[in-house]
C-alpha cells in the first residue's frame, strides 16, 4: 500500500501481480467521515495512473477496469478533490505485470564442456516460480532441465554438442511457471560453432632460432582440435601496450619476427572455432621469456680529459656513456679500451669492468689515439676511435660569449657564439660540466653532450641539481684541434646560507691580510659571484666600509690597506650569488699596530 491509507482504501482484483494481457479492477473507497462533507456528491474521487488522470467519480467510492498494462510495475493513486482546496491523496497500489524470462544465452565451455544457459528472470513477482529449460535438436532430440529455486537464472544440461555435425541447429527456451500461469522466453537457436567457447590454449612454449637472429622465434601451444583462429598478444614485461597478431589455421605454432633482443616478454594466446561464429576463449596463462642477447649495436660516446703532470708525462682520463638498452642488446660484460701511439706503433689494450671511465699516464710526446668498445656475450660494438689532442689549445677555435642561465630546478641553458675565425672548421661542439669542487676534483663525475656545428645553445639537465654550482666548458672541435671557453653556472639558486669564516688576520707592512675558510659546498646554494669584507670601528654606530672581491675558486685570502693604526676594528665577511647575499660570517676584532701618519 502507498503511504498509510488513513483516509481510504484501494483494492485490486484479481491480484496486484498479473500476467501480461490480463484485466484488473481497481476500486477506491473513502473511510467514514473522511470525505469533504457528508454529502457524497461533493466528494470527487480521482484515479491516477502514474501522474495521468484515468478516471473520476462523485461519491464515496470509485471503480475502474484497466487493461493493457505493460510489463513491470504501474503505480495507481486515488485522490480526493474538494471545492476550494488541493487534492488530497487517499491511497494507492502498485500493479506488477510479470515479465517473461529474457536474454536467454547458452554457452559450452570447450569442445567437451556441457551446454549451460543463463537468462534474466525479469522483475521479481514474489511468487513461487519454477523454471524449465528445454533444448531441442535435430531429429526431434530434446532435453529438459528443471529448477525449483525461485531465484534460478542458470541451468546446465549436462550434455555437450558434438562437432561431428557442426551445422546442426539446436534451440533453447526457458519457461517460468507460477500461480498466475506460465511464460516463455524467446527461443535461442544456435549451432555447435555458435555456442562453443574454446578452452584457452595451454602448454605454451617459445623457441629461439640458433643464436644468429633473435628477430626469429617460434611460439608453440596446444589447442582444442577444432580451433581455426588464434590471436596472440605479446609485450615487453615493463610495457603496458600489447602487440596483437591474428592468425588463421596456425595449428599450434607461429613465428614472431619483431622481438627485441635481451628483453623479457609476456605472451598470451586466445582461440576461436570460426571466423565469424562463436566467441574467443579466455586468454591463456601468461608465458614469460627473455629473448637471447645479440652483439651490441651502435657506438659508445667517448670523451676525455688531459692533465699535465710534469715535463714528460700527462694523465689521460677517458669517459664513456653506457649504451642504451636497445643498443647494448645484452648484459655488457666489459669495455675494451685500446690506447695506441700512432708514430711508434705502441699499443695497450685493457678490459674495464664495472666502470665507465679509465685513467692512465702517457708520454707528452707522440700522437695518441684511443678506441673503446662494449662487449656482451655475443660480441663487441663497433669501436669509437678518437685522437687525443689539446682540447683548448687553439685560441682561434674558442667559442665566445658563453653564458649559462637557469632554465628550471634541474636544467641550465648554455649559449655561446661561434669562434670568430675558422668557423667552417668546427665539426662539433662538446658541452662539458662537472660540479665545482675546490681542491681535488678527480673523483667528481664528468658530464658532457655533443652538439652539431650549427647549434649555438644546449640545454643541460643530466646530473644537474638545484643549489649547486657547475663548471661548464664549451669545446669547439675540428679535425685535429680544439678551442674552449668556460663559465660557472647553476640551475635553481639562492643566497648562500652562511658567510665565510675568517680564520686569521695578519699585519703586513701597514696593511692586513684576511684569510678565510670557504663556505661548505652544501651551503653555497649556487655559484658564488663575490665575497664582501666588511669592517667598522668597534663601538661605532657608523655604516661599515666594505670591499667586494670577485669570487675565484682557489682564493681564500685578501689584503686591506685602508685601516687606521691603533684603532680596533670589527671585521666580517659575506658571500653573494646572483640571488643575493649571505648572512654574515663570524666577526673578528683587529687593531693595526703600525705607526700613525
Amino acid at each position: 500500500k502507498i503511504d498509510e491509507c488513513k483516509r481510504g482504501d484501494v483494492t485490486v482484483k484479481p491480484s496486484r501481480v498479473i500476467l501480461l494481457g490480463s484485466t484488473v479492477n481497481i476500486s477506491c473507497s473513502l473511510k467514514p467521515r473522511q470525505g469533504c462533507s457528508p454529502y457524497s456528491r461533493r466528494n470527487k474521487l480521482i484515479l491516477y495512473k502514474f501522474d495521468r488522470r484515468i478516471n473520476f467519480h462523485h461519491g464515496h467510492s470509485l471503480n475502474a477496469q484497466v487493461t493493457g498494462l505493460p510489463l513491470g510495475t504501474t503505480l495507481f493513486v486515488c485522490k480526493l478533490a474538494c471545492i476550494n482546496s488541493d487534492e488530497i491523496q487517499i491511497c494507492g497500489a502498485e500493479i506488477l505485470v510479470g515479465e517473461q524470462p529474457q536474454n536467454l544465452s547458452c554457452i559450452q565451455k570447450g569442445e567437451q564442456g556441457t551446454v549451460a544457459c543463463t537468462w534474466e528472470r525479469g522483475q521479481d513477482t514474489h511468487l513461487y516460480t519454477e523454471y524449465t529449460l528445454q533444448l531441442s535438436g535435430p531429429k526431434n532430440l530434446t532435453w529438459q532441465k528443471q529448477c525449483k529455486d525461485h531465484y534460478c537464472d542458470y541451468l546446465d544440461f549436462g550434455i555437450n554438442l558434438t562437432p561431428e555435425s557442426p551445422e546442426s541447429n539446436f534451440t533453447a527456451k526457458v519457461t517460468a511457471v507460477n500461480s498466475l500461469g506460465s511464460s516463455s522466453s524467446f527461443p535461442s537457436t544456435f549451432t555447435f560453432l555458435d555456442i562453443v567457447r574454446p578452452l584457452p590454449p595451454w602448454d605454451i612454449r617459445i623457441k629461439f632460432q640458433k643464436a644468429s637472429s633473435v628477430s626469429r622465434c617460434t611460439l608453440y601451444w596446444r589447442d582444442e582440435g577444432l580451433v581455426l583462429l588464434n590471436r596472440l598478444r605479446y609485450r615487453p614485461s615493463n610495457s603496458r601496450h600489447w602487440n596483437m597478431v591474428n592468425v588463421t589455421e596456425a595449428r599450434g605454432r607461429h613465428d614472431l619476427l619483431d622481438l627485441k633482443p635481451f628483453t623479457e616478454y609476456e605472451f598470451q594466446i586466445s582461440s576461436k572455432l570460426h571466423l565469424y561464429k562463436g566467441s574467443w576463449s579466455d586468454w591463456s596463462e601468461t608465458l614469460r621469456a627473455q629473448t637471447p642477447e645479440e652483439e651490441p649495436t651502435g657506438m659508445l660516446d667517448v670523451w676525455y680529459m688531459k692533465r699535465h703532470i710534469d715535463y714528460s708525462r700527462q694523465q689521460i682520463s677517458l669517459f664513456w656513456k653506457n649504451l642504451s638498452v636497445s643498443e647494448a642488446r645484452g648484459k655488457i660484460l666489459h669495455y675494451q679500451v685500446t690506447l695506441q701511439e700512432l708514430t711508434g706503433g705502441k699499443v695497450m689494450t685493457q678490459n674495464i669492468t664495472g666502470h665507465t671511465s679509465w685513467t692512465t699516464v702517457i708520454s707528452r710526446t707522440g700522437n695518441w689515439a684511443v678506441a673503446v668498445s662494449a662487449a656482451n656475450s655475443k660480441g663487441n660494438s663497433l669501436p669509437t676511435r678518437i685522437n687525443i689532442m689539446n682540447l683548448c689549445e687553439a685560441g682561434l677555435l674558442a667559442p665566445h660569449q658563453v653564458s649559462a642561465n637557469s632554465e628550471s630546478m634541474d636544467s641550465i641553458l648554455v649559449t655561446w657564439q661561434p669562434p670568430r675565425k675558422d668557423l667552417s672548421a668546427v665539426q662539433e661542439y662538446v658541452v662539458e660540466w662537472r660540479q665545482l669542487h675546490p681542491g681535488d676534483d678527480t673523483q667528481i663525475p664528468l658530464n658532457w653532450l655533443r652538439s652539431p656545428p650549427y647549434n649555438v645553445s644546449a640545454l643541460i639537465s643530466e646530473n644537474i641539481k638545484p643549489y649547486t654550482c657547475y663548471e661548464i666548458r664549451v669545446y669547439a672541435l675540428s679535425e685535429d684541434q680544439g678551442g674552449c671557453s668556460s663559465i660557472l653556472g647553476n640551475s635553481e639558486h639562492k643566497a648562500p646560507l652562511s658567510g665565510p669564516h675568517i680564520n686569521a688576520i695578519t699585519e703586513e707592512k701597514g696593511s692586513i691580510l684576511i684569510s678565510w675558510n670557504s663556505i661548505p659546498v652544501q651551503e653555497q646554494m649556487g655559484c658564488l659571484l663575490h665575497y664582501r669584507i666588511y669592517w667598522k670601528e668597534r663601538d661605532s654606530n657608523s655604516q661599515p666600509q666594505l670591499c667586494e672581491i670577485p669570487y675565484r675558486v682557489s682564493q681564500n685570502s685578501h689584503p686591506i690597506n685602508s685601516l687606521q693604526p691603533r684603532v680596533t676594528y670589527v671585521l666580517w665577511m659575506t658571500a653573494l650569488t646572483a640571488a643575493g647575499e649571505s648572512s654574515q660570517g663570524n666577526e673578528r676584532e683587529f687593531c693595526l699596530q703600525g705607526k700613525a701618519n
Epitope: 569442445e111 567437451q112 535438436g137 535435430p138 531429429k139 532430440l141 550434455i159 555437450n160 558434438t162 562437432p163 561431428e164 555435425s165 557442426p166 551445422e167 546442426s168 582440435g225 577444432l226 581455426l228 570460426h274 571466423l275
Partner: antibody, heavy 116, light 107 residues
Framework: EVLLVESGGGLVKPGGSLRLSCAAS????????MNWVRQAPGKGLEWVSS????????HYADSVRGRFTISRDNAKNSLYLQMNSLRAEDTAVYYC?????????WGQGTLVTVSS | DIQMTQSPSSVSASVGDRVTITCRAS??????LAWYQQKPGKAPKPLIY???SLQSGVPSRFSGSGSGTDFTLTISSLQPEDFATYYC?????????FGGGTKVEIK
Amino acid sequence: EVLLVESGGGLVKPGGSLRLSCAASGFTFSSYSMNWVRQAPGKGLEWVSSISSSSDYIHYADSVRGRFTISRDNAKNSLYLQMNSLRAEDTAVYYCARSELGFDYWGQGTLVTVSS
Amino acid sequence: DIQMTQSPSSVSASVGDRVTITCRASQGISIWLAWYQQKPGKAPKPLIYAASSLQSGVPSRFSGSGSGTDFTLTISSLQPEDFATYYCQQANSFPLTFGGGTKVEIK
C-alpha cells in the same frame, strides 16, 4: 528422397592416384557435413575423412593424412576424395555418408582395389 | 583417439530371442553414440543416434541406452531380417571411430 551415389572406384597400382565422387540429391547439400567411410574386404568400418558444410573444417584419419584430400562443390551437390600415393591397405569399399548426429544416410559404395 | 570396444564379437540367437550388444568408449562421449546394421554386400543402415533415439523407419524392437562410456543396443525380439553385423560409432570428437562389430547369427 535422400540419395548418395559414389563413383570413380577401380583398380590402381600402388603409388597411383584415384578421385572418387559422390553425387547428392534429395536434401540441401550445402547445410550438412559430409564424410567418407571405408570397409576393407571382410573387415569393419573405418572413418576416413570429414568436411563441414562450408569447407571450414576438414578432418582426416591418421592412416590417410597427407595422401588423401577431401573437397566439395556445393553448387554441384558433389563430394570428392582425391587419393594419392595409394597403398595395398587402402583397398576397400568407399562409402560417402551424410552427418547428422552420426551418419544418417549412406551411398551404396564404390570399390577401390590397389594391386600391382 | 577414442577407442570403441564392442562385445561380444559374435552372438548366436534364435528368432524371438532378446539380444543385447554392448559398446564401451575409452573415454566419456556423453550421449554421442550411433548404432548401425550392415548386411553382406550392402551399405550400413543407421538404427540409433544420440545413444537412445531411433532413426525414422526403424522398428521399435530396437532400443539403445547408456551415456558416458557404457552403451547398449537391445533387440527385444529377434526377427529373421535382423541377422546381420552391428556396429557402434562415437560422434563425440574427431577422429570418429567405430567398434569392431558384432555378428548376430542364426543359432
